[in-house]
C-alpha cells in the first residue's frame, strides 16, 4: 500500500511489532529442530552477525540474517521460514546487498549449522526486544 513508509524508515514501535511476530516463530522453529535433531551440538564455526553496530539501540541486521534463512529454507520447516523471511524483509534497508551463504555438505555439520543459526537468531531477537523495551529509543 502507498500508505506504508519504506521499510527502512519504520519507527521503533513498528520494529517492535515485527520483533514480537518473529519471536514465537523463531522459538517454535528452534524447539522443533532440537526435538527432531537430538544430540546435535552448536557449531563454533558459524557466527550470525545479527545486530548492526552503527545504531543505538542496536538494530536487527536483516540483510546479514536473510541469506542464512534463505540457505536453510530447503532443509527446515519451509512454511515457518517463509514467515520469518517475510518479516525480515520488512526490516531490510533498501539496496543493502545480501551475501550468498552455502550450507555445509556434511550432514552432521549441516545440522549443527542450522541449529546454530536458529539459536543465535533467537538470542538476537531477545537482545533487540530488550533494547526496544528499555526506555527512550
Amino acid at each position: 500500500s502507498s500508505h506504508m513508509a519504506p521499510t527502512h524508515q519504520l519507527p521503533p514501535s513498528d520494529v517492535r511489532k515485527i520483533i514480537l511476530e518473529l519471536q514465537p516463530l523463531s522459538r517454535g522453529l528452534l524447539e522443533d529442530y532440537q526435538k527432531k535433531e537430538t544430540g546435535v551440538p552448536e557449531s563454533n564455526r558459524t557466527l550470525l552477525l545479527c545486530l548492526t553496530s552503527d545504531s543505538q539501540p542496536p538494530r536487527l541486521n536483516s540483510s546479514a540474517i536473510l541469506p542464512y534463512f534463505r540457505a536453510i529454507r530447503p532443509l527446515s520447516d519451509k512454511n515457518i521460514i517463509d514467515k520469518i523471511i517475510e518479516q525480515l524483509d520488512k526490516l531490510k534497508f533498501q539496496h543493502e546487498p545480501e551475501t550468498e551463504i552455502s550450507v555445509p555438505a556434511d550432514t552432521f555439520e549441516c545440522k549443527s549449522f542450522i541449529l546454530t543459526i536458529l539459536q543465535q537468531f533467537s538470542a538476537c531477537l531477545e537482545s533487540v526486544f530488550k533494547s526496544l523495551n528499555s526506555g527512550p529509543q
Epitope: A5, L10, P11, D14, L20, E21, K90
Partner: antibody
C-alpha cells in the same frame, strides 16, 4: 467500506471485569493490527493495546496486569477484557484498525461508553 | 512515554479564516527523515477521523484546506479556510514509540 462496531455493558461494578467486543466488517482481522483506545471524561485519549493478524498481543505497560485482548477469527471479532476495574476506568472505549507499518489508525469504531459505579 | 502537548486547548475562529493548532512532543518522533505524527478530528458523538498521517500527508477523502507540517518535536495542523463543518476537537498522536500517546485535544469553535 471498513466498519468497526464496539459492544458491551455500559455499567460495570468496581472490582469487576469489563469485556467489550469489536465486530469488524469490510476487512479481516487476520491482516493488520487491531487496537483498543479509550477516552476519559475530559477528553484525554489513552492507547490500551493491540492484537495482531497472527494473534500476538501487546499492551500499554500502565495496564499490563489487568488487560487481555483476544479474538475469534471465525466471527471476525476481537475483544477487550479489563479486570479489577475502578471508577478511573469510566471512559468511552474505541476499537481501531492499524493496517500497515508506518501508517496510522485509519478506521475507528463509534465508541461505547462504560461507567464504573456501584 | 512521549508526552504530547497540544495548544491552544480551545480556539475560536471566524468562518473563512485560518486555524492553527500546535503539538509538541517531549522527544523527537522522527526516524530516517519521516515523522510519525498524525492528526485526528473528532466531532461530538462521532469516532475520531484520520486527517493527516506522517505529519504532512493528507488522508484520502480529506479536503485540501487541511494541512500538516513540522518535524522532530514541533508540529502544526492548519485549517484554511475554516468552514462551519470543521467544528470539532482535534488531536495529535504519535506512533513513533510504544506506548502510543495523544495530545490533550484542541476544541475548535466558530466565532
Amino acid at each position: 467500506e471498513v466498519q468497526l462496531v464496539e459492544s458491551g455493558p455500559s455499567l460495570v461494578k468496581p472490582g469487576g471485569s469489563l469485556r467489550l467486543t469489536c465486530s469488524v466488517t469490510g476487512d479481516s482481522i487476520t491482516s493488520g493490527y487491531w487496537k483498543w483506545i479509550r477516552k476519559f471524561p475530559g477528553n484525554k485519549l489513552e492507547y490500551m493495546g493491540y492484537i495482531s493478524y497472527s494473534g500476538i498481543t501487546d499492551y500499554n505497560p500502565s495496564l499490563k496486569s489487568r488487560i487481555t485482548i483476544s479474538r475469534d477469527t471465525s466471527k471476525n471479532q476481537y475483544y477487550l477484557q479489563l479486570n479489577s476495574v475502578t471508577t478511573e476506568d469510566t471512559a468511552t472505549y474505541y476499537c481501531a484498525r492499524y493496517p500497515n507499518y508506518g501508517y496510522a489508525m485509519d478506521y475507528w469504531g463509534q465508541g461505547t461508553s462504560v461507567t464504573v459505579s456501584s | 512515554d512521549i508526552v504530547m502537548t497540544q495548544s491552544p486547548a480551545s480556539l475560536s475562529v471566524s468562518l473563512g479564516q485560518r486555524a492553527t493548532i500546535s503539538c509538541r512532543a517531549s522527544e523527537s518522533v522522527d526516524t530516517y527523515g519521516r515523522s510519525f505524527m498524525h492528526w485526528y478530528q473528532q466531532k461530538p458523538g462521532q469516532s475520531p477521523k484520520l486527517l493527516i498521517y506522517r505529519a504532512s500527508n493528507l488522508e484520502s477523502g480529506i479536503p485540501a484546506r487541511f494541512g500538516g507540517s513540522g518535524s522532530g518535536t514541533d508540529f502544526t495542523l492548519t485549517i484554511d479556510p475554516v468552514q462551519a463543518d470543521d467544528v470539532a476537537t482535534y488531536y495529535c498522536h504519535q506512533s513513533y514509540e510504544d506506548p502510543w500517546t495523544f495530545g490533550g485535544g484542541t476544541k475548535l469553535e466558530i466565532k
